[in-house]
């Protein structure tokens, strides 16, 4: 989701934005700070064992509107928040995992729990 009532259409900013990065630091980052023409983000998602993992970093302007919209993805628990209002603004973002929605699928007499599959979109 966008913070601070930003419009959904991304517009070119006149200056570079610095963001905190964790688990998502590009090669051109320094001291866990990355640079972008787009947004800072913080994301929480489940890893393959169901443990919540927090990731933060930079999103380039190109495609960031889609990334930050946080459209629910079937079978994937994750949430992302984006910001641009100041450097390292993503230090103050604390997204939470959406509520667990376990669906039981009936296949004959046996009940199968549907497993979550995890896809990374960066």
């Amino acid at each position: 989701k966008k913070e601070d009532g930003e419009s959904t259409a991304p517009t070119a900013r006149p200056k570079v934005l610095r963001c905190k990065c964790h688990h998502h630091c590009p090669e051109d980052s320094v001291n866990n700070i990355c640079s972008t023409d787009g947004y800072c983000f913080t994301m929480i998602e489940e890893d393959d064992s169901g443990t919540p993992v927090v990731t933060s970093g930079c999103l380039g302007l190109e495609g960031s509107d889609f990334q930050c919209r946080d459209t629910p993805i079937p079978h994937q628990r994750r949430s992302i928040e984006c910001c641009t209002e100041r450097n390292e603004c993503n230090k103050d973002l604390h997204p939470t995992l959406p509520p667990l929605k376990d669906r039981d699928f009936v296949d004959g007499p046996i009940h199968h729990k549907h497993h979550h599959h995890h896809h990374h979109h960066h």
């Epitope: 006149p14 200056k15 051109d28 320094v30 640079s35 100041r86 450097n87």
Partner: antibody
């Protein structure tokens, strides 16, 4: 038009500190970073660091940490660089420069002479 | 730190000639956003540098079209198609992809 005004020259004694100024006009001061760059004859250009006037966020070249401190006064659209414990190695021309994703405008530079 | 190597150090030309300056970086200047932050400046004696080309090939406002920039990754070139007297001075390449930002050592364009 964009202008960055710097004093022409400063002379100080070794061991002293000095605060260089850079007054910006012709644009919204908080919309761009301000960088500081050092030039010594025959030694090219060296990036000292930068400050974002919108939130006072700074980035430094490791080489100049402890030597340079960057600040701004948004009410007067002025950027400052404090240089401490000056030696002859600090004698140089110091430029302030406006930065978005690249430097597009430079001040005229302040020539600093450190001499006893 | 990224080392920017400029060649030649000195470039004697006749007015009207084409001039070409090379700039090589010690690592790729392609930023994680996909942009390449390689720029060219001209510094005339006693003056501050002036921006000519930004992001490899974009001419800054007011810069004549005889100036052009090209290249990618680690290898970049500035070309002046027909050198005029006002073009004389020291040309610097600069990168703002990696902190600390760094500059080439300069190429002095002078009359042959």
């Amino acid at each position: 038009q964009v202008q960055l005004q710097q004093p022409g020259a400063e002379v100080v004694r070794p061991g002293a500190s000095l605060k260089l100024s850079c007054k910006a006009s012709g644009y919204t001061f908080t919309s761009y970073w301000m960088q500081w760059i050092k030039q010594r004859p025959g030694q090219g250009l060296e990036w000292i660091g930068e400050i974002d006037p919108s939130d006072n966020y700074t980035m430094y070249n490791q080489k100049f940490k402890g030597k340079a401190t960057l600040t701004v006064d948004t009410s007067s659209s002025t950027a400052y660089m404090q240089l401490s414990s000056l030696t002859s190695e600090d004698s140089a021309v110091y430029f302030c420069a406006r930065f978005g994703f690249y430097v597009d405008y430079w001040g005229q530079g302040t020539t600093l002479t450190v001499s006893s | 730190d990224v080392v920017m190597t400029q060649t030649p150090l000195s470039l004697p030309v006749s007015l009207g000639d084409q001039a070409s300056i090379s700039c090589r970086s010690s690592q790729s200047l392609v930023h994680s956003t996909g942009n390449t932050y390689l720029h060219w400046y001209l510094q005339k004696p006693g003056q501050s540098p002036n921006l000519l080309i930004y992001k490899v090939s974009n001419r800054f406002s007011g810069v004549p079209d005889r100036f052009s920039g090209s290249g990618s990754g680690t290898d970049f070139t500035l070309k002046i198609s027909r050198v005029e007297a006002e073009d004389l001075g020291v040309y610097f390449c600069s990168q703002s992809t990696h902190v600390p930002f760094t500059f080439g050592s300069g190429t002095k364009l002078e009359i042959k």
